[in-house]
């Protein structure tokens, strides 16, 4: 019961695997917590120990590595299930130790059921394809290390529930699925089923990912400010509410940070004394182009406020834009009674 460096439950690595399929799970210690790998640890005399806590239990127990057909085994820093069962769900701990050193981390493993159309509670990775961009491929993910290179598995691809055969612009090519020209109609869930033999048994690996067709970098432009513009003048009397929308369109750009902000007389609204509020809303098109609107609001505008410069700014990886709102003070209409009196020569 000597002290052990406990990294706790690593919920960042919520591992989900399908029921009745092989699963290989690497001990996260070497990937994310320690500065050395398993080989180094092993040659330094450290031992890797696995144990688990069943779902809805508090009791840590050793993993049974003596199951029929070696259903659960360990190989170096990998825990193998051949295959998984539903009640394998729980928190798994790998501990690296010797007489003077100890480090451990736990992680949740969820064994998930799927239906005949591959629907399940599994969180699906998203792969983005550029619209009308030429040939693009997706690859059946997370199948490395399950079988040696000498084994030639069979791979079947599905879109939703349907086996991909004779599709117009989607062609299965072994582990890859090629999209000749991606269109919005290609959005959906794609599943590869990898079937391979091992020790006289046949195993299946099912991998589903979501394909999302997004705007192409060929069509990407700097942000476009729709409002404010040259056609709208914000003409207000002191005491009225001033509302100016800054509406900006952003082309989809992979990993681009889209920013919108207001300046008033060259300063951020937070840095000035006037009582201004800004509300933001965001909407997306089917190809993930983005429209951001920031509405600048001054409840009771003063004549000084109506002389200020209100500028909407926007920036993406493609460039920066800015547009000043046309703000002016409304000239009060002449009072009719006074005009009339003067007109009649009243004194």
């Amino acid at each position: 019961s000597e002290r052990c460096d406990d990294w706790g439950l690593d919920t960042m690595r919520q591992i989900q695997v399908f029921e009745d399929e092989p699963a290989r799970i690497k001990c996260p210690l070497f990937e994310h917590f320690l500065k050395f790998n398993y080989s180094t640890a092993h040659s330094a005399g450290l031992t890797l120990i696995w144990y688990w806590t069943r779902q809805d239990r508090d009791l840590e127990e050793p993993i049974n590595f003596r199951l029929p057909e070696n259903r659960i085994s360990k190989e170096k820093d990998v825990l193998w299930f051949r295959p998984t069962l539903l009640n394998d769900t729980g928190n798994y701990t790998c501990m690296l130790r010797n007489t003077t050193y100890c480090s451990k981390v736990a992680f949740p493993l969820e064994v998930v059921q799927k239906d005949s159309c591959f629907n399940s509670p599994m969180k699906l990775p998203v792969h983005k394809l550029y619209i009308e961009y030429g040939i693009q491929r997706i690859t059946c993910p997370n199948v490395d290390g399950y079988f040696p290179s000498s084994v030639k598995p069979t791979i079947t691809w599905y879109m939703g529930c349907y086996k991909i055969q004779n599709f117009n612009n989607v062609i299965p090519e072994g582990m890859n699925l090629s999209f000749l020209i991606a269109l919005i109609s290609n959005n959906g869930n794609y599943t590869c089923v990898v079937t391979y033999p091992e020790n006289g048994r046949t195993f299946h690996l099912t991998r589903t990912l979501t394909v999302k067709v997004v705007g192409s970098p060929k069509n990407a432009v700097p942000p476009v400010i729709h409002s404010p513009n040259d056609h709208v003048v914000y003409e207000k009397e002191p005491g009225e509410e001033l509302l100016i929308p800054c509406t900006v369109y952003f082309s989809f750009l992979m990993d681009s940070r889209n920013e919108v902000w207001w300046t008033i007389d060259g300063k951020k609204p937070d840095d000035i004394t006037i009582d201004v509020t800004i509300n933001e809303s965001i909407s997306h098109s089917r190809t993930e182009d983005e429209t951001r609107t920031q509405i600048l609001s001054i409840k009771k505008v003063t004549s000084e406020d109506l002389k200020r410069s209100y500028v909407c700014h926007a920036r993406s990886a493609k460039g920066e834009v800015a547009k000043a709102a046309k703000v002016k003070q409304k000239v009060p209409a002449p009072r009719y009674t006074v005009e009339l009196a003067c007109g009649f020569g009243a004194t």
């Epitope: 432009v221 476009v224 300046t263 834009v321």
Partner: antibody
Framework: SLEESGGRLVTPGTPLTLTCTVS????????MGWVRQAPGKGLEYIGI??????TYYASWAKGRFTISKTSSTTVDLKMTSPTTEDTATYFC??????????????WGQGTLVTVSS | DIVMTQTPASVSAPVGGTVTINCQAS??????LAWYQQKPGQPPKLLIS???TLESGVPSRFKGSGSGTEFTLTISDLESADAATYYC??????????????FGGGTEVVVK
Amino acid sequence: SLEESGGRLVTPGTPLTLTCTVSGIDLSSYAMGWVRQAPGKGLEYIGIISNSGTTYYASWAKGRFTISKTSSTTVDLKMTSPTTEDTATYFCARDRYANTHGIFSLWGQGTLVTVSS
Amino acid sequence: DIVMTQTPASVSAPVGGTVTINCQASESIYSDLAWYQQKPGQPPKLLISFVATLESGVPSRFKGSGSGTEFTLTISDLESADAATYYCQCTYGGSGSGNGAAFGGGTEVVVK
């Protein structure tokens, strides 16, 4: 950076093309403009080309000048029929923004055009 | 066409003093105004855009104000390095209106 070239002595009526060569600037992300300055005089705006290639000119410059993007790194100013009044240093300038204002935050050193018979 | 009129044509003030340059537009340009500094033999340098937005690296001694048709550039705590010609500019370059990015005639600032 921006560098103008093509300035020289020409006779009135002889077309002349000035070139602005940019480096480290993506012309699809900025508007580019041309401004001139006659010797000892003030700045005079000629026109601007947007990041997408739309051109805008000062009223006096329409028909006398043509701005175009000739490659991903060059913007040209064509003087269709120069007169002696067109003698000036011609500056190429980059807009501060992608949308077209004429807020010129980066300038070349200028190229001198002398129109004389 | 928009015409920008700058006054005075020349102004002189001592080191540490303040100068004010005025710029008038022939029609309302709202907040679309920039100020530039130009020294002999050099290209202009952008100081201020959108009436009051200081370019990065420009000292806060430079202050732009105004709206509509009347604009002012104030330079306080004058330094000898501020001696230059200053231009205002309407920045309607892409509006399609004639002379949308017209410059004023310039104001020469002499620092004594």
